[in-house]
């Protein structure tokens, strides 16, 4: 696949290991934690980088209402179980054999059991909601030209098809980008809209995965957007199942 | 190394244009904006406007509007400033200088050109 | 416009000294940047997004503040710190700069 061949390396992946040892010398890159091949002519799976930020050293985070069962990964990062694709086993536990079920996406979605608890299914995220804050600027955003410049970044920064970039709303100083994809929707080739948004959500912390580019320099009309805050709903399709005291605390 | 080289000193006539350069190195010129800065002699600096080379966006200071030109030849990673109808008023030193950004941060003007000094005189 | 006023416009520090000046926006501004010009020179940035270190600059500036004082320090003045220091705002259009402070070696 298309590792850059002169130097070896992933440019849609920093956190992996690459050397010329495909077919006919060609170079194959692995990802750091789980060793599995990945395919550098597209994004990762949100599963494999999590599991390769785990393994990495760690250094001395009209609008729409978010619907009732959306879900914020409030539990941050945990090390986890990724199939022979790539994508989150639908149960994860840890170390103290703590089990929980997640969606596509990675985030828990019942609550905390034991070894015992049953995920019958991976149950697909699909709609996230990221809402961003940019902060003050000397030039005000044109609606038009922001949600272009937001559908053109997922285009071809991400290779998110543009049928899945499904709006931008805009209110000053708030922008939502709402990504749909059903299972119906995605095809072969298809870029998962969680893991479009999860390399997002690195760029605007100044954390991006791409080897070797600089920080995302985003613009509109020339004037550079910066973000204050990010949150990031999780829409499954089927309801998340939490206890009634989770849900009144 | 990020380099900015301005064209060299110029003497022009009262009511001629002069076209200054700013030739952009070390980076992707495409990438970020040109600035371009005023400063008369024993004065402060004054922002005259600037330029993004990937669309040719621009933002003027109203003072400069319709006193400046900004432009860019991406194929040769340049920058341009066109002032028109030169008076006394216009004899300064101009200075290019780019501004990098992320969506993290404004890293501000840096560098700048070594600027290039304008004397109006008849 | 945004009008930075600079005090003080002149001082003087001995080597070793700390020093420090301020820039007073007219009006509420979120970040301030800092650049140094010495005679012959063109400007250097020194302080971006109010606090935050250019690159290649010494650790003995600092920048703080927030909506209309911000402030630039020299914890220890070095002989090659004698300059004129600007202050600007990139929060509204026209972009807008201190008119300076010349700090001179004593």
């Known amino acids: 696949h298309t590792a850059a061949q002169d130097n070896c390396t992933c440019p849609t992946n920093k956190m992996t290991v690459c050397s010329p040892d495909g077919p006919g010398g060609r170079c194959q890159c692995r990802a750091l934690g789980s060793g599995m091949a990945v395919d550098c002519s597209t994004l990762t799976s949100k599963c494999l980088l999590l599991k390769a930020r785990m393994s990495a050293p760690k250094n001395a985070r009209t609008l729409v209402r978010p619907s009732e069962h959306a879900l914020v990964d409030n539990d941050g990062l945990y090390d986890p179980d990724c199939d022979p694709e790539g994508r989150f086993k639908a149960r994860q536990c840890n170390q103290t054999s703590v089990c929980w079920c997640v969606n596509s996406v990675g985030v828990r979605r019942t609550d905390k059991g034991d070894l015992s608890l049953r995920c019958d299914e991976l149950v697909r995220t699909h709609h996230i909601l990221i809402d961003l804050r940019h902060r003050p600027t000397a030039g005000a955003f044109n609606h038009s030209d922001l949600d272009a410049e937001l559908r053109r970044l997922f285009r071809e920064r991400y290779r998110l098809h543009p049928k899945f970039v499904a709006a931008v709303h805009y209110e000053q100083p708030t922008i939502q980008i709402e990504l749909r994809q059903n299972t119906s929707q995605k095809a072969a080739g298809d870029v998962d809209i969680g893991d479009a948004a999860y390399y997002f959500e690195r760029d605007i912390k100044g954390e991006s995965l791409f080897q070797g580019r600089g920080g995302l320099d985003l613009r509109v009309r020339g004037e550079p957007l910066q973000v204050e805050r990010t949150l990031i709903y999780y829409l499954d399709e089927i309801p998340p199942k939490f206890s009634m005291k989770r849900l009144t605390a | 190394e990020v380099q900015l080289q301005q064209s060299g000193p110029d003497l022009v006539r009262p009511g001629a244009s002069v076209k200054l350069s700013c030739k952009a190195s070390?980076?992707?010129?495409?990438?970020?904006?040109i600035n371009w800065v005023k400063q008369r002699p024993g004065q402060g600096l004054e922002w005259i406007g600037w330029i993004y080379p990937r669309d040719g966006s621009k933002k003027y200071n109203e003072k400069f509007k319709g006193k400046a030109t900004l432009t860019v030849d991406t194929s040769s990673s340049t920058a341009y400033m066109e002032v028109h109808s030169l008076t006394s008023e216009d004899s300064a030193v101009y200075f290019c200088?780019?501004?990098?950004?992320?969506?993290?941060?404004?890293?501000?003007?840096?560098?700048w050109g070594q600027g290039t000094s304008v004397t109006v005189s008849s | 416009a945004i009008v930075l006023t600079q005090s003080p416009a002149i001082m003087s520090a001995s080597p070793g000294e700390k020093v420090t000046m301020t820039c007073s926006a007219s009006s509420s501004v979120n970040y301030i940047y800092w650049y140094q010009r010495k005679p012959g020179s063109s400007p250097r940035l020194l302080i971006y997004?109010?606090?935050n270190l250019a690159s290649g600059v010494p650790v003995r500036f600092s920048g703080s503040g927030s909506g209309t004082s911000y402030s630039l320090t020299i914890s220890r003045m070095e002989a090659e710190d004698a300059a004129t220091y600007y202050c600007?705002?990139?929060?509204?259009?026209?972009?807008?700069f201190g008119a300076g402070t010349k700090l001179e070696l004593k």
């Open positions: 200088a780019t501004r990098f950004a992320t969506v993290v941060s404004n890293y501000g003007l840096d560098p």
């Open positions: 070390g980076y992707t010129f495409t990438s970020s904006d």
């Open positions: 600007q705002q990139w929060n509204s259009y026209p972009l807008t």
């Open positions: 997004d109010t606090s």
